[in-house]
Amino acid sequence: RAPRCRELPAQKWWHTGALYRIGDLQAFQGHGAGNLAGLKGRLDYLSSLKVKGLVLGPIHKNQKDDVAQTDLLQIDPNFGSKEDFDSLLQSAKKKSIRVILDLTPNYRGENSWFSTQVDTVATKVKDALEFWLQAGVDGFQVRDIENLKDASSFLAEWQNITKGFSEDRLLIAGTNSSDLQQILSLLESNKDLLLTSSYLSDSGSTGEHTKSLVTQYLNATGNRWCSWSLSQARLLTSFLPAQLLRLYQLMLFTLPGTPVFSYGDEIGLDAAALPGQPMEAPVMLWDESSFPDIPGAVSANMTVKGQSEDPGSLLSLFRRLSDQRSKERSLLHGDFHAFSAGPGLFSYIRHWDQNERFLVVLNFGDVGLSAGLQASDLPASASLPAKADLLLSTQPGREEGSPLELERLKLEPHEGLLLRFPYAA
């Protein structure tokens, strides 16, 4: 008799793929543009990335450090009107892209939450949640919550408002903290909160360290849904050298939870390569004309246009991973088992019932390594086969689709492999 199928978990839209943050409309659009109408014209690009949600803004009126002149219900006219916003919402909906609005109040000021009048600000947020939910927004983000006194209780209240409207609505909180205990205390009182933090931001050193961070986090958070990013707002290049970007893309897309990226992560956008550009929001490189300040500073392979035409580019890798993440059951909601693969390596399996299974092997080191996959670490339900097909490598030169013997697996420096193998009873 065939074994019974495992019951599928309830999946919310943010469980099904990546979120894409556009914190600075002007930097994202470039060329002196930077409004909601212009963003609407970029939705096809977001569709091509297969992202499930757009985390937008903040775009509300905020006079720096002035509570009275901060209005979370009014769109800053520099970004457009309510009509523009509504039009963006409708267009995004047609393309199955959800819109999450950042309501971090004092985004132009020193302290994101103002240093005084906490209750006044919290009431403004409550009003804004209700207003924008009724206007059709799919969720909200609030950042820098380490600056918000009694953050846990406010987040619980805002979560109740968000979920009270519809279980299909999302609240994301962001913190600069990388401390697991602080992160857990924020999560404790907020069941469905998605939290972005700097927890993984110092993980770039070794595979063992990354494995330790990831497994500690997953063990500590139990069954709850996680999000994966390196910070609450900044680009991957703020934390990682260029040679690790592909590795991290592969990891973020294949860990159990929602991957969260900032605009430009998909092309390796790096403020340091663009003199005069702010670290937190450099101009998006659509093509070589996007950064006219210094002629020749931008080459084609740094841009969306150039990378779109190159199947071996970071952007092409991002699109492939995003596509896999959104359609494979084992990556959507599969179980996760990390196991030993040797020093410098981080490896894990994703599997769901009788669906195709995935093996991820990541070499964080700058030397080539042979992987000694310790299958004995794995439960019987997640055993390794002798061979697995190579779905993709982060490095060029491997023949995709070819079966690889897992006992003889060798990885290049900074290489990540995504392998697939069938369920075997």
Epitope: D127, A128, F131, Q134, G136
Partner: antibody, heavy 119, light 114 residues
């Protein structure tokens, strides 16, 4: 119990500014929003604006350049100012509480105050 | 702005009989986010302020007699008084309660006793 009471001059000259106050009791202005609505004699209702618990304001765009809503939470008062009035602004003016989460419905209303614009 | 149109303008119904008031909006008032319909009904008796009867198209406000019911979705709505009482003589208004301001009212329907 919840109460709202409008007050202000019953007669205003054309081109002047109409000023009304809504005094509330039985609830806090830091927890509920307050709408202003008007009704010309023998006619229907027209929504003017809403001031939220946190102080944000939505206005009827048809009157936006002339209407100002504010509040003094410590006095439990919401005020409405309408500038450059004409005879067409003659109406009973009501304040009403925004009573439900995820709805702009008005669950409690003041008795209304008649304002006549005439020289 | 959303335009609300009520019909009929006035209605005469015998005591104990059913009264039906219609309201049409110029665009759908269904919020796909929570599947609620953002339409509100008020009753205004002579010399009094309006009174909230129904919100979300069919949710009766507490204290409102169950002879009042609201129905409809999208753009077409109905307020029904199942058995008209003398105290129900009033003008009834529908209001768009949807999304962005202004939250406009219908022109009103006057209900009298035949």
């Amino acid at each position: 119990q919840v109460q709202l009471q409008e007050s202000g001059p019953g007669l205003v000259k054309p081109s002047e500014t109409l000023s009304l106050t809504c005094t509330v009791s039985g609830f806090s202005l830091t927890s509920y929003g307050v709408h202003w609505i008007r009704q010309p004699p023998g006619k229907g209702l027209e929504w003017l604006g809403l001031i939220w618990a946190g102080g944000s304001i939505n206005y009827n765009s048809a009157l936006m350049s002339r209407v100002t809503i504010s509040k003094d939470t410590s006095k439990n008062q919401v005020s409405l100012k309408l500038s450059s009035v004409t005879a067409a602004d003659t109406a009973v003016y009501y304040c009403a509480r925004k009573g439900h989460m995820y709805s702009y419905a008005m669950d409690y209303w003041g008795q209304g105050t008649l304002v006549t614009v005439s020289s | 702005d959303i335009v609300m149109t009520q019909s009929p303008d006035s209605l005469a119904v015998s005591l104990g009989e059913r009264a039906t008031i219609n309201c049409k909006s110029s665009q759908s008032l269904l919020n796909s986010g929570n599947q609620k319909t953002y339409l509100t009904w008020y009753q205004q008796k002579p010399g009094q302020p309006p009174k909230l009867l129904i919100y979300w198209a069919s949710t009766r406000e507490s204290g409102v007699p169950d002879r009042f019911s609201g129905s409809g979705s999208g753009t077409d709505f109905t307020l029904t008084i199942s058995s008209l009482q003398a105290e129900d003589v009033a003008v009834y208004y529908c209001q768009n309660d949807y999304s962005y301001p202004p939250w406009t009212f219908g022109q009103g329907t006057k209900v009298e006793i035949k």
